[in-house]
C-alpha cells in the first residue's frame, strides 16, 4: 500500500484550526489478522530524506499522537493529554488519517509527517509516510481562512510505498 | 528502567527442544506499542532474528525457522518464552531477548543473552 | 526477504581517524534502517534510527546517512572506547541484519 497526502501545503492565519490529512491507498487490508499503527511527528526537508528526524508536536512526541486499530476499525485519540494541547488525530474506514490543530501560532508552522504501520499477523509488516507543510501567518497578508494546495502527482516527496 | 532477563538450560542435546525464557521488568508485556523478541548470535558470527511475538499473542517468525519455532506469551507473568525444535550443532549460539517499539523499528531493549550449547 | 550487505567485515584505523561502513538492502527501504555497536561479551547498543537519528546519549561523534538501498555508519574521530562490532539492521519488513563490521585500533 501507500500513503499520499492530497494537500502538500496548508497555509493558515494564526488563531485558525487546521486538519493536516494522510490517505492509505492501494490494497489496504481489512481483515482481523491486520493492526495499524499510525501516527503523526514534525520534522524537517532532509537533504536526501524527507521525515527522517522526528520532532513533537506541541511538546507531544509521536508516542504521545499514535493510535492503533483493526483493519476494520476506526479510531480517534481520546486522551486528555492530546487534547490539553489543542490535538487530535482520527483515523476513518476509509482509509483517512488526520490531525487537528486548534488555535493555531506562529511556533506551529513547519513541516509535518504522518507515519503508518501495517501489522499482518504471522506474515510480515510494512510502514510509510508522508510529509506536508504547514504555514501559519498572521498580519495583513494572512488569509482568512486556510488554503489548501493540492499534491502534485509527481512530487515523490509526498507518497511513499511499501 | 526497562529490564529483560534470559533464563534456560546452556547444553541441550540435538534433536531435542530448545526452551528458553524472558522475564520482563520495569514495563507491561501487555503494552500495546511493542514487539517481544528473539535473537541469535552463533559463537562468532552475526545477529540473526528469530521471531517475535505482538502483544495480543501474534507472531512473526523468521522463514528459515518458522517450521521450528515457537513463541508464547505469559502475560500474567510478564514474561514471554522460545521454544525451538529439533536443534542441531547449528543451533548453538547466545539467545537475546529483546523488545521492539512498533513506531520507532528497532530493538531497543535487550537482555544481556544467554550460551546455548547444543552437544550430546 | 530482505538482504542487508554490510561492508568491510572488519577494518583496522588509528584513533582520532574518520571510519565509514556501509550497509545495502536487497530493495528499497525507505530510510527505515538502524545501527547498534557491539562489545564482546555484551548485548548490541542502539545507536542510530531511521537511517539518521542518533540515540539519547549516543556521542555526536557517530552519525549515519542514506537512503532507499544505500547506507552508511561514521566515526568522525575513533576512540579507544568504540573497539566494537557494528551492525546495520532494517526494520522496513521483518527484521533482517547486516553480518557486522568488526573495528580495532591500528
Known amino acids: 500500500f501507500k500513503v499520499a497526502t492530497p494537500y502538500s501545503l496548508y497555509v493558515c492565519p494564526e488563531g485558525q484550526n487546521v486538519t493536516l490529512t494522510c490517505r492509505l491507498l492501494g490494497p489496504v487490508d481489512k481483515g482481523h489478522d491486520v493492526t495499524f499503527y499510525k501516527t503523526w511527528y514534525r520534522s524537517s526537508r532532509g537533504e536526501v530524506q524527507t521525515c527522517s528526524e522526528r520532532r513533537p508536536i506541541r511538546n507531544l512526541t509521536f508516542q504521545d499522537l499514535h493510535l492503533h486499530h483493526g483493519g476494520h476499525q476506526a479510531a480517534n485519540t481520546s486522551h486528555d493529554l492530546a487534547q490539553r494541547h489543542g490535538l487530535e488525530s482520527a483515523s476513518d474506514h476509509h482509509g483517512n488519517f488526520s490531525i487537528t490543530m486548534r488555535n493555531l501560532t506562529l511556533l506551529d508552522s513547519g513541516l509535518y509527517c504522518c507515519l503508518v504501520v501495517e501489522i499482518r499477523h504471522h506474515h510480515s509488516e510494512h510502514r510509510v509516510h508522508g510529509a506536508m507543510e504547514l504555514q501559519v501567518q498572521t498580519g495583513k497578508d494572512a488569509p482568512s481562512n486556510c488554503v489548501v494546495y493540492p499534491s502534485s502527482s509527481q512530487d515523490s516527496e509526498n507518497i511513499t510505498a511499501a | 528502567q526497562l529490564q529483560l532477563q534470559e533464563s534456560g538450560p546452556g547444553l541441550v542435546k540435538p534433536s531435542e527442544t530448545l526452551s528458553l525464557t524472558c522475564i520482563v521488568s520495569?514495563?507491561?508485556?501487555?503494552?500495546?506499542?511493542?514487539?517481544w523478541g528473539w535473537i541469535r548470535q552463533p559463537p562468532g558470527k552475526g545477529l540473526e532474528w528469530i521471531g517475535s511475538i505482538f502483544y495480543s499473542g501474534n507472531t512473526h517468525y523468521n522463514p528459515s525457522l518458522k517450521s521450528r519455532v515457537t513463541i508464547p506469551v505469559d502475560t500474567s507473568k510478564n514474561q514471554f518464552s522460545l521454544k525451538l525444535s529439533s536443534v542441531t550443532a547449528a543451533d548453538s549460539a547466545v539467545y537475546y531477548c529483546?523488545?521492539?517499539?512498533?513506531?520507532?523499528?528497532?530493538?531497543?531493549?535487550w537482555g544481556q543473552g544467554t550460551l546455548v550449547t547444543v552437544s550430546s | 526477504d530482505i538482504q542487508m550487505t554490510q561492508s568491510p567485515s572488519s577494518l583496522s584505523a588509528s584513533v582520532g581517524d574518520r571510519v565509514t561502513i556501509t550497509c545495502q538492502a536487497s530493495q528499497d527501504i525507505t530510510n527505515y534502517l538502524t545501527w547498534y555497536q557491539q562489545k564482546p561479551g555484551n548485548a548490541p547498543k542502539l545507536l542510530i534510527y531511521?537511517?539518521?537519528n542518533l540515540e539519547t546519549g549516543v556521542p555526536s561523534r557517530f552519525s549515519g546517512s542514506g537512503s532507499g538501498t544505500d547506507f552508511t555508519f561514521t566515526i568522525n574521530s575513533l576512540q579507544p572506547e568504540d573497539v566494537a562490532t557494528y551492525f546495520c539492521?532494517?526494520?522496513?519488513?521483518?527484521?533482517?541484519f547486516g553480518g557486522g563490521t568488526k573495528v580495532e585500533i591500528k
Open positions: 539492521q532494517q526494520y522496513d519488513n521483518l527484521p533482517t
Open positions: 531511521d537511517a539518521s
Open positions: 520495569g514495563g507491561s508485556i501487555s503494552s500495546s506499542g511493542y514487539y
Open positions: 529483546a523488545r521492539r517499539d512498533i513506531l520507532t523499528g528497532p530493538f531497543d531493549y
